[in-house]
Interface confidence: medium
């Protein structure tokens, strides 16, 4: 806590100026008014502040507004932000994208910091959806971004904003998040032609079901391996040699070099030796002839 | 045009002090504050600190902290360095350079001194 | 204490494209402008970029800088002899105001 001193004669703070970087920290705290430091927040960032400095600078907004600061001060906070904690944050009421492009600015290039995961948490929260121009910024600060919320918040993500998601923006996400964003990738696409859907769609197929998946199989959209095996494993299993060939196209070669991975292996095991020679792979593993194939999904829901 | 011009070249005994000058001109003297920046031979940029012409008020590099007391004299458009309980290893060209406003850079600096320390 | 990092020295034959990088933290170039300075041999150093990528006027526009996160770099295309010059990266630092990279010395084949 910085000690309550009298401003020295001739030292009071007119304006925030450069000047002001030769204040000791007393001399900040009893030469700077608050009132005057809020409405030229936007200066600060120019002047060569030290950190030291910036705590007295953020004490005195922190007495001013003690129930969080105002949207016209947080938009101007630029390198003050990163003083910021958490728990000043989530005091914040955050409604324009411009604020937030602004502080999301200051932290270009870093890793996304515990700050910027409150800021982005209460924008969201008070705007009640992930829209897309939101969306949009935040993809474009954060690829990863969308793939760090649970399935529960990409619920709130409407179809119209799935258009601004890159394939790269879905690099880091796992099953369950994929199971969320497919349905609503499905239905923003919907209107499209095949083969433009399915690029769109392409990077959504790990949330597939196997129905989708025998429906691709029919339009020749030579899907390849890499998609193939980010595919849901329940999804693929029941897919047929023949619907496999078809959904891969060219691609299918490339089964050889993964039958020991997941979902290709599992999938082997699930078909007829004799269905996979056709292919001309050598795939090794799958059912000999002569065998009885029980569905045992289908028996235990029959008893 | 804006100019920033040195006093000459210093030789000084380990313990002495030693004082130079920079003449500021072609600009407001007290409009633009002036940094000091030392450089050992052979060696990269040292800031050593900063003055205010407007009201003399000045910020040192924790390094030089009471060794270094930079002044001016606003009536002649000079702004002076004084370094004292010098030592071999302060042997450097020392430049006065000017700060522009609003953004972290020099934009005009003097032609050197070269102060050197020797017994 | 030297918190900017530059490489001692780079070189390249004229007509090519050559690269200086500065490399910081969050308290300097994370969180400021970066500017570069061009030392030729025995003279004073001279403003190259400001504000992480402007060219003051009379600086050739084979000069260009950029930043991203804590690091900057400085990229020099169309190498001439008279290149050959040290080249320092500056910021201020937060935490100990003001900040010069180590300098790199650059050699034109």
């Known amino acids: 806590e910085v000690e309550k001193t009298a401003c020295p004669s001739g030292k009071k703070a007119r304006e925030i100026d450069e000047s002001l970087i030769f204040y000791k920290k007393w001399e900040l705290e009893a030469c700077v008014d608050a009132a005057l430091l809020a409405t030229q927040m936007d200066r600060v960032n120019a002047i060569p502040f030290t950190y030291e400095q910036l705590d007295v600078l953020k004490h005195k907004l922190d007495e001013l507004y003690p129930q969080g600061y105002p949207e016209s001060v947080i938009q101007h906070l630029g390198y003050l932000f990163l003083k910021m904690s958490p728990e000043d944050i989530r005091k914040w009421n955050v409604t324009s994208l411009e604020t937030l492009k602004a502080l999301l600015e200051v932290n270009k290039g870093h890793e996304m910091s515990p700050q910027v995961a409150t800021l982005i948490d209460r924008f969201v929260k008070g705007r009640g959806q992930l829209d897309k121009d939101t969306l949009d910024t935040l993809t474009a600060f954060y690829p990863g971004y969308l793939c760090s919320l649970s399935p529960e918040e990409l619920s709130s993500v409407p179809p119209s904003s799935i258009w601004a998601v890159r394939p790269q923006d879905l690099d880091t996400c796992d099953p369950r998040q994929l199971d969320v964003l497919y349905p609503k990738a499905r239905l923003a696409f919907q209107n499209m032609n095949g083969s433009e859907y399915f690029v769109k769609i392409q990077s959504f197929l790990g949330g597939a079901p196997t129905e989708d998946l025998k429906a691709l199989s029919q339009q020749n959209v030579s899907m390849d391996l890499a998609t193939f095996m980010k595919l849901r494993t329940d999804a693929v299993l029941p897919l047929t040699v023949a619907e496999v060939q078809k959904l891969l196209g060219p691609h299918v070669e490339g089964l050889k070099a993964e039958e020991r991975h997941r979902p290709v292996r599992d999938w082997i095991l699930r078909q007829r030796q004799d269905d996979l020679d056709t292919l001309g792979l050598g795939l090794q593993g799958g059912i000999p002839n002569g065998y009885l194939v029980l569905d045992l999904s289908m028996q235990e829901a029959l008893s | 045009q804006v100019e920033l011009v040195q006093s000459g070249a210093e030789v000084k005994k380990p313990g002495a002090s030693v004082k130079v000058s920079c003449k500021a001109s072609?600009?407001?003297?007290?409009?633009?504050?002036i940094n000091w920046v030392r450089q050992a031979p052979g060696q990269g940029l040292e800031w050593m600190g900063i003055?205010?012409?407007?009201?003399?008020?000045?910020k040192y590099a924790q390094k030089f902290q009471g060794r270094v007391t930079m002044t001016r004299d606003t009536s002649i458009s000079t702004a002076y360095m004084e370094l004292s309980s010098l030592r071999s290893e302060d042997t450097a060209v020392y430049y006065c350079?000017?700060?522009?406003?609003?953004?972290?850079?020099?934009?005009?600096w003097g032609q050197g001194t070269l102060v050197t320390v020797s017994s | 204490d030297i918190v900017l990092t530059q490489p001692p020295s780079v070189s390249g034959a004229p007509g090519q494209r050559v690269t200086i990088s500065c490399s910081g933290s969050?308290?300097?170039?994370?969180?400021?402008?970066v500017s570069w300075y061009q030392q030729l041999p025995g003279t004073a150093p001279k403003l190259l970029i400001y504000?992480?990528?402007q060219r003051p006027s009379g600086v050739p526009d084979r000069f260009s800088g950029s930043k991203s996160g804590t690091s900057a770099s400085l990229a020099i295309t169309g190498l001439q002899s008279e290149d050959e010059a040290d080249y320092y990266c500056?910021?201020?630092?937060?935490?100990?105001?003001?900040?010069f990279g180590g300098g790199t010395k650059l050699t034109v084949l």
């Open positions: 350079a000017r700060w522009h406003h609003g953004t972290w850079i020099f934009d005009y």
């Open positions: 072609g600009y407001t003297f007290t409009g633009n504050y």
């Open positions: 969050s308290s300097n170039i994370g969180s400021n402008y």
């Open positions: 500056s910021t201020y630092d937060r935490r100990t105001f003001s900040v």
């Open positions: 504000n992480d990528n």
């Open positions: 003055i205010n012409p407007h009201g003399g008020d000045t």
